[in-house]
């Protein structure tokens, strides 16, 4: 069964720039991917990024760039105002869902903190199902 | 642009076997999977499997386990099919599609004919 | 097995509003997304894609073409039928293990 992982790379010469690369381990489908954050733009849960292996990337500020890295990996680059950056990232969580084939979906979430440089390798993070 | 050539039509005798091919080219081969549908006369569409040709990973719909046989040369970005112990059955037209779980691109079809 | 099940045909005037609908037996929606897909097939030629995840269309495809719906129920509407739409229709979910189509609907002109 899949497992999704998280990481979130914050660029070292530009605080207002980051970067969220998620994707999936073991084998399967991948029929879209959606990166998604919560507390970072508002209380709610912002959609940053809807990404189709066939038919394209949508985005949505403050996404500014989403691609795939790999068939099994996207990445999605972010960037706001130096301020409201460093003001908001501590309660920001990133989620990447994963909708596979014949697994279902898998979630995965990581909450990025001052003191968190982010995952320097792809390990699970929090992972949710819904099959 | 995304093409999917697939080989000639076949006439087979019930109990052979056939190899129906499927050369893909104007996309990353690798990033993929290769499905084969089956349609048969009555327009009915049948999934028969897929292969991913990355990983060499297949998955099979159960009915056609035994029957259908997926295969993949990167070198040459083609896809096959092998079809065994034939039936009248199996006569149909057979297609490649490239995609994830949606079919984006299709192959022209392959006509397979079983009969004695 | 998913079953999708499709009215066999439906006749319609140039010009005019064509609804062709597809029940699926068990819900295709997962998540927010509804995985289900829309393939036309002329007479002769290979399916191609209409629609995918239920009303996403992909690029190059008429704007005539839409589709709707969500659960068991959805829905392909071409608006306004032209002479070049006469073909089969087919639905297509990918929810499930194994992938399975409808059984097609045949657009014919009245």
């Known amino acids: 069964s899949p497992e999704v992982w998280v990481q979130v790379q914050m660029e070292a010469t530009n605080l207002s720039s980051f970067s969220v690369h998620c994707g999936v381990l073991g084998y399967s489908l991948i029929s879209l991917v959606t990166v998604s954050c919560e507390g970072f733009v508002d209380a709610g849960r912002t959609k940053l990024a809807v990404l189709h292996p066939e038919f394209g990337t949508q985005q949505w500020a403050p996404a500014r760039q989403a691609h795939w890295e790999t068939p099994n990996s996207v990445s999605v680059t972010l960037t706001m105002g130096q301020s409201k950056a460093r003001s908001s990232l501590a309660n920001t969580t990133f989620c990447c869902e994963f909708v596979t084939f014949p697994h279902g979906s898998r979630v995965a979430c990581r909450d990025l903190h001052r003191s968190d440089p982010g995952l320097s390798a792809p390990t699970p993070a929090l992972n949710l199902q819904a099959d | 642009q995304v093409q999917l050539q697939q080989s000639g039509a076949e006439l087979a005798k019930p109990g052979s076997s056939v190899m129906i091919s499927c050369k893909a080219s104007?996309?990353?081969?690798?990033?993929?999977?290769v499905h084969w549908i089956k349609q048969t006369t009555g327009q009915a569409l049948e999934w028969t499997g897929y292969?991913?040709?990355?990983?060499?990973?297949?998955k099979y719909n159960e009915k056609f386990k035994g029957k259908a046989t997926l295969t993949v040369d990167k070198s040459s970005t083609t896809a096959y099919m092998q079809l065994s112990s034939l039936t009248p059955v199996d006569t149909a037209v057979y297609y490649c599609?490239?995609?994830?779980?949606?079919?984006?691109?299709w192959g022209q079809g392959t006509l397979v004919t079983v009969s004695s | 097995d998913i079953v999708l099940t499709q009215s066999p045909a439906l006749a319609v005037s140039l010009g005019q509003r064509a609804t062709i609908s597809c029940r699926a037996s068990q819900s295709v929606s997962l998540s927010s997304y509804n995985l289900m897909q829309w393939y036309q097939q002329k007479p002769g030629q290979e399916p191609k894609i209409l629609i995918y995840d239920a009303s996403n269309l992909p690029s190059g495809i008429p704007a005539r073409f839409s589709g709707s719906g969500s659960g068991t129920d959805f829905t392909l509407t071409i608006d306004p039928v032209q002479a070049d739409d006469i073909a089969t229709y087919y639905c297509?979910?990918?929810?499930?293990?194994?992938?399975?189509f409808g059984s097609g609907t045949k657009l014919e002109i009245k």
């Open positions: 104007g996309y990353t081969f690798t990033n993929y999977a």
């Open positions: 292969i991913a040709p990355g990983s060499g990973v297949t």
């Open positions: 297509q979910q990918s929810k499930d293990d194994p992938l399975t």
């Open positions: 599609a490239s995609g994830t779980t949606r079919f984006a691109y």
